[in-house]
Amino acid sequence: SGTTNTVAAYNLTWKSTNFKTILEWEPKPVNQVYTVQISTKSGDWKSKCFYTTDTECDLTDEIVKDVKQTYLARVFSYPAGNVESTGSAGEPLYENSPEFTPYLETNLGQPTIQSFEQVGTKVNVTVEDERTLVRRNNTFLSLRDVFGKDLIYTLYYWKSSSSGKKTAKTNTNEFLIDVDKGENYCFSVQAVIPSRTVNRKSTDSPVECMGQEKGEFRE
């Protein structure tokens, strides 16, 4: 078979949820491999995912060093086999990613209702504080640790017997709501960062209803 040209990567896309961050690109390689480099605006280019035939590279370890920095990645195409490099003067082809600022852009993962507890006409609903891969002093920080008061949760709740939803908001991970005595309620929560312009909201949590396992009831 004849020689082919190396092809530059394209459609470089950041996929990030709760700071777990993967760069994806196309095309599937034929007679070429890729190496990814990542940098902050002021930093040096660091090579990752050396000589890979994958079309994705996990860059979480790099971006969690400072989630408020803006990062740029680039994907190099290296000939591997019966190919000709189309870069000039022996320089390999590369393509730049869009800029990515984890703090502003990582998707908020689907939250989980950890528990709810009814005491009379009050219900305390607790949202699980999900662990991220962001580290401080050798421990992993939770979503709340990272975002602080920038992160709020919206609670949707309704009587099992009707469809009319009410909402409540909290900038902690707990809600205390009033309910009608003797009624069963269902709950769903959503994570929100109101100050954001993109990726402001998570998907809704799975619905949890009173009378099921997660609840505690006290008169």
Partner: antibody
Framework: QVQLVQSGSELKKPGASVKVSCKAS????????MNWVRQAPGQGLEWIGM????????RLNQKFKDRAVLSVDKSVSTAYLQICSLKAEDTAVYYC??????????WGQGTTVTVSS | EIVLTQSPATLSLSPGERATLSCSAS?????MNWYQQKPGQSPRIWIY???NLASGVPARFSGSGSGTDFTLTISSLEPEDFAVYYC?????????FGGGTKVEIK
Amino acid sequence: QVQLVQSGSELKKPGASVKVSCKASGYSFISYWMNWVRQAPGQGLEWIGMIYPADSETRLNQKFKDRAVLSVDKSVSTAYLQICSLKAEDTAVYYCAREDYGSSDYWGQGTTVTVSS
Amino acid sequence: EIVLTQSPATLSLSPGERATLSCSASSSVSYMNWYQQKPGQSPRIWIYGISNLASGVPARFSGSGSGTDFTLTISSLEPEDFAVYYCQQKSSFPWTFGGGTKVEIK
């Protein structure tokens, strides 16, 4: 021009430690991964691992994970390989080599480490 | 780890002859380099990415292969080609080298 200059030969007793240095010049030291490779007398090459000087991230061959430590001193653009609990089988020439794509190829001159009682 | 087996261990040939050096991998490799080493010298990159000649390497050298079988070919040996050649895979960590093929004058 790019240069990697390694420390001189070492004679060590079994059980001792050795620290080999590799001083880089002619390029931005912190921006390139640095490999360490060894070659026992009359034998082939063996990749020990590599380190990224800017943040000291290390990739180590599992064979060496308990006995080899890679480090850098950015202030003097120098990479280090330390091997502890030396055995006769560790007698080899140790090379540092900048990680590069393609034709770029920069190796130190090699450091001979002899382990003998 | 990926084990690279080079054959033959020694190749005894005369100048002008064709040399074929093989490197067999224990599992599939997508990125293979070849190094040349002469006595008392550090290794030098010779072929990278399976088939790309490093700068200054004469056109009588070529590299080929895919998957688990790779070849370095010297079409017509010159006196300066007599040396040891090592293959190296960079497809998965730990990066590994073959045991080398010594090309010696017959």
